[in-house]
């Protein structure tokens, strides 16, 4: 006799208004009496509709939450599994049931903002900027909302960057406990003459940090050939261990680059009689603290003004 189990009931994908953080939920299947004592596990697969691969999780719960790109639709499917302990070793699963979440197609794509860029300056404040849609009426204006886990609900930007009295960006500070988790943004718009398509963005703040440039550069030469360069980590909340540095050294007309995770570097002069010895440095958050980052601006150049003769110190 073939053992069968029913799929979960009432599978649906819900939007609680958190700008892309969706709830996938379902109810337990109708279970026949002989399996009442068995543990049910649910295999859930989901993806944005343009994705090649499904994300798969197994849960004993009746809800799962995750972040999605709301610029595209979402589809999911779920089935019930019975433990082999309950089925004499055979793998028993229900048929799949499916659900989808369609994005709003209100407003043409040409009305959606363009070139959304966000930078988390010195791990202290976030600046996002955008350009208006390609074809929008002159009364169109945009509004930015954001959410991350820890906020009760999505919040609107309170400090807009403006151009010609239109919102073209937003500055956010005091983002407590907002890094190392998905940060969701929606920029929607309004016009009396046409609907405006919303734009959604998701990233993690630590991956878009642009630090301040290093400061207090110092260069010295020992034994007339050993160059020692040092600098200070910029002020602010980024721990010193999180920086990586790129250094450009200039000796007369020759320049070369080097890299380090420390805030000093030693190397040999290329020519004893060189008259000009300078360096400058920039920094970025390293791979131990983020998956990505943005290089700081270059520091001011620092030059060694010492005497180039053989007895110089």
């Amino acid at each position: 006799l073939e053992i069968k189990v029913n799929p979960p009931q009432d599978f649906e994908i819900l939007d609680p208004g958190l700008l892309g953080y969706l709830y996938l939920q379902w109810k337990p299947p109708v279970v026949i009496e002989k399996f009442k004592g068995c543990t049910l596990e649910y295999e859930l697969k989901y993806r944005n509709v343009d994705s090649d691969s499904w994300k798969t999780i197994i849960t004993r719960n009746l809800i799962y939450k995750d972040g999605f790109d709301l610029n595209k639709g979402i589809e999911g499917k779920i089935r019930t599994h019975l433990s082999e302990h309950c089925t004499n070793g055979s793998e028993v699963q229900s048929p799949w049931i499916e659900a989808s979440y369609g994005i709003s197609d209100e407003g043409s794509l040409e009305t959606k903002i363009q070139d959304m860029k966000c930078i988390y300056y010195n791990w202290q404040y976030l600046v996002c900027s955008w350009k208006p849609g390609k074809t929008v009426y002159s009364d169109t204006n945009y509004t930015m909302f954001f959410w991350y886990e820890g906020l009760d609900h999505a919040l609107q930007c309170a400090d807009y960057l403006q151009h010609d009295e239109k919102n073209v960006g937003c500055k956010l500070s005091n983002l407590d406990s907002s890094d190392y988790k998905d940060f969701f943004i929606c920029v929607n718009g309004s016009s009396k003459l046409e609907p405006i398509r919303s734009s959604y963005t998701v990233f993690q703040l630590q991956n878009i940090v642009k630090p301040l440039p290093p400061e207090f550069l110092h260069i010295s030469v020992e034994n007339s050939i050993d160059i020692r360069m040092k600098w200070s980590t910029p002020g602010g909340p980024i721990p010193p261990r999180c920086y990586t540095y790129e250094i450009v050294i200039r000796e007369d007309d020759i320049s070369w680059e080097s890299a380090t995770d420390k805030n000093d570097m030693k190397l040999k002069r290329r020519a004893n009689e060189s008259e000009d010895l300078c360096f400058f440095v920039r920094c970025k958050v390293n791979i131990y603290c983020a998956d990505d980052g943005i290089w700081s601006e270059w520091s001011e150049e620092e030059c060694w003004e010492g005497y180039t003769g053989p007895d110089s110190k």
Partner: antibody, heavy 121, light 108 residues
Framework: EVQLLESGGGLVQPGGSLRLSCAAS????????MSWVRQAPGKGLEWVSA????????YYADSVKGRFTISRDNSKNTLYLQMNSLRAEDTAVYYC??????WGAGAFDYWGQGTLVTVSS | DIQMTQSPSTLSASVGDRVTITCRAS??????LAWYQQKPGKAPKLLIY???SLESGVPSRFSGSGSGTEFTLTISSLQPDDFATYYC??????????FGQGTKVEIK
């Protein structure tokens, strides 16, 4: 008496490969799901991978996905972990563990004694 | 991923003491939680499964309670053999299966 016996650990260079085995006895091997769990020196427990009783479904931690492959041979009562592109951070004692009940995972009621994998140049 | 946070990280106690270790899940995991004991150089040993069910052969001085996000392991009267590191583990939703960072119970 339930027994799980790991083997195959050792010293390997970064980028190298190893295959761990876990020989099981004392229970009907094809029934429970099985997992590999590792413990870096002086650190806590980290789940690595799981496989259902039939071997039909496998699951991995993000840190090993695409590099490690879990498999089982129910006719030989043996669980395997093929580890490729090994990194220094994979250095750990690797335990195989039996799921008490559950299709893919659960509480682990029996553990092997562990096999040490050291990734170093 | 579901994060599991144990407290305290280290606990100093004496034989005969009542000891409580807490484990907090970052989201509800119903009662799908296990507790393990591990001694240096040894494999972990299952003590409690499904939050409160005592594994066969485990002394009754060990008990587990809680559901949702807050769980506790209690040792009613600490014995010399109980000085070890204890881990909680969720198996509600995976991958990944996640463990707490461990609580070391040491002699005061």
């Amino acid at each position: 008496e339930v027994q799980l016996l790991e083997s195959g650990g050792g010293l390997v260079q970064p980028g190298g490969s190893l295959r761990l085995s876990c020989a099981a006895s004392g229970f009907t091997f094809k029934l429970p799901a099985m997992s590999w769990v590792r413990q870096a020196p002086g650190k806590g427990l980290e789940w690595v991978s799981a496989i259902t009783g039939s071997g039909g479904s496998t699951y991995y931690a993000d840190s090993v996905k695409g590099r490690f492959t879990i498999s089982r041979d129910n006719s030989k009562n043996t669980l395997y972990l093929q580890m490729n592109s090994l990194r220094a951070e994979d250095t750990a004692v690797y335990y195989c563990a039996k799921v008490r009940y559950g299709w893919g995972a659960g509480a682990f009621d029996y553990w092997g004694q562990g096999t040490l994998v050291t990734v170093s140049s | 991923d579901i994060q599991m946070t144990q407290s305290p990280s280290t606990l100093s106690a004496s034989v005969g003491d009542r000891v409580t270790i807490t484990c907090r899940a970052s989201q509800s995991i119903s009662s799908w939680l296990a507790w393990y004991q591990q001694k240096p150089g040894k494999a972990p040993k299952l003590l409690i499964y499904d939050a409160s069910s005592l594994e066969s052969g485990v002394p009754s001085r060990f008990s587990g309670s809680g559901s949702g996000t807050e769980f506790t392991l209690t040792i009613s009267s600490l014995q010399p053999d109980d000085f070890a590191t204890y881990y909680c583990q969720q198996y509600d939703t995976y991958p990944p299966i996640t463990f707490g960072q461990g609580t070391k119970v040491e002699i005061k």
